[in-house]
Amino acid sequence: KFSKQSWGLENEALIVRCPRQGKPSYTVDWYYSQTNKSIPTQERNRVFASGQLLKFLPAAVADSGIYTCIVRSPTFNRTGYANVTIYKKQSDCNVPDYLMYSTVSGSEKNSKIYCPTIDLYNWTAPLEWFKNCQALQGSRYRAHKSFLVIDNVMTEDAGDYTCKFIHNENGANYSVTATRSFTVKDEQGFSLFPVIGAPAQNEIKEVEIGKNANLTCSACFGKGTQFLAAVLWQLNGTKITDFGEPRIQQEEGQNQSFSNGLACLDMVLRIADVKEEDLLLQYDCLALNLHGLRRHTVRLSRKNPIDHHS
């Protein structure tokens, strides 16, 4: 239930996060599961624990194994497992499947390739990017923050992309590389000003107090893969994440491609345990892309339960 796979290359830095959640103030203890030996916290060690993070600086093939992390809350010890595998560096250019992160796909209008796991590291821009082991050069390639943007993507751009960056720990530098495949979807598409299919403008949605309710924001943006298209919900003009109501969450639906070929997106707003005060809020379905933003407003009203008379 709380286990996670992590991998890296020998002589590179590898940082692994404990799969169990805990507050930053909680103590986290790490152990090497096979020997039950405690991982030290002193940074002078090559392998050391730092709160929720386990750091291999640098990693060695012998470090492979299962590591146990125990998050010590005041009430319970919450246990997680990190299955770590460190591989020898390949002499040739090929990156084996077991070192690959998830494949991403792009098109002419959307060609972002994110560098996997980089958020765990203390790195500074710019990233170096390689395709099939060749350093990327030319104005078509732009390293931006933690991702690579390719302009005017062509089918020939498909391949394995490796990001390389330096992790800094107390003044010492360690190299990190991560590779993922990029596939190109060959689509002749176009984009339009967003069209919201649901909800209707100023729609009144009936809900029952105490029950769960779902609102779906659905919009279409044109044909083919869209660059910079999004649907989202706002509450009283505020982003859901900023509104601070744990009962109300948004959840991405499926990318939809209707029979007419239009590219559409869904965003479902889930309201758990509907309360009276939810009826006072204004719910805005927003659809935006490079052409602009369209907004449809929904309000909730109380559904009166049907009386059953004998």
Epitope: P24, P74, F76, N77, P246
Partner: antibody, heavy 119, light 106 residues
Framework: QVQLQQSGAELVRPGASVTLSCKAS????????MHWVKQTPVLGLEWIGA????????AYNQKFKGKATLTADKSSSTAYMELSSLASEDSAVYYC????????????WGQDTTLTVSS | DIVLTQSPPILSASPGEKVTMTCRAS?????MHWYQQKPGSSPKPWIY???NLASGVPARFSGSGSGTSYSLTISRVEAEDAATYYC?????????FGAGTKLELK
Amino acid sequence: QVQLQQSGAELVRPGASVTLSCKASGYTFTDYEMHWVKQTPVLGLEWIGAIDPETGDTAYNQKFKGKATLTADKSSSTAYMELSSLASEDSAVYYCIRVDSNYDYFDYWGQDTTLTVSS
Amino acid sequence: DIVLTQSPPILSASPGEKVTMTCRASSSVSYMHWYQQKPGSSPKPWIYDTSNLASGVPARFSGSGSGTSYSLTISRVEAEDAATYYCQQWSSNPLTFGAGTKLELK
């Protein structure tokens, strides 16, 4: 929606034992810790202890060790607290409470069980 | 055990007034939670992790603090705010509550 249904009021004799129950619904019982709290006019709110229904692990306030025993039945999504060797100072309102697993605070409280210990 | 001392024990305020109640811990805690209880009802989560409002809590409430000193503030008191407010720490076992501040409206 999340509900914690506690058993009804109890009137018991000193020296006896009693088991209070708390039936959970509206969420996955094993995903959240269940805690118990005692409330009296004199001492206010006191944390008794907690159980992790997934593992059966328990944590107690030292003050209530030997007094309270916490258990959970996964099949019925019910948490139990047994109170033993009852005395008048055990007379109180008792709450079972679910804990928010992200922020570690008491997010859903049962409606309470009133326990009266009297001869 | 970490002892939480709430002050004042009773707070009397007029509607529209700004009020602040405090909770002092006998040793440093990382976060403070607050609960509201009205007579005959179970306590309700009110503020968690020092400053986050729980579900359905009006925006006139706010929480702040760090270390050993925490507070709950109501910018403009309303009649429905009359209740007892308890602070609670989750930094060490046993978890402990304050004795409460009872907010009365004039």
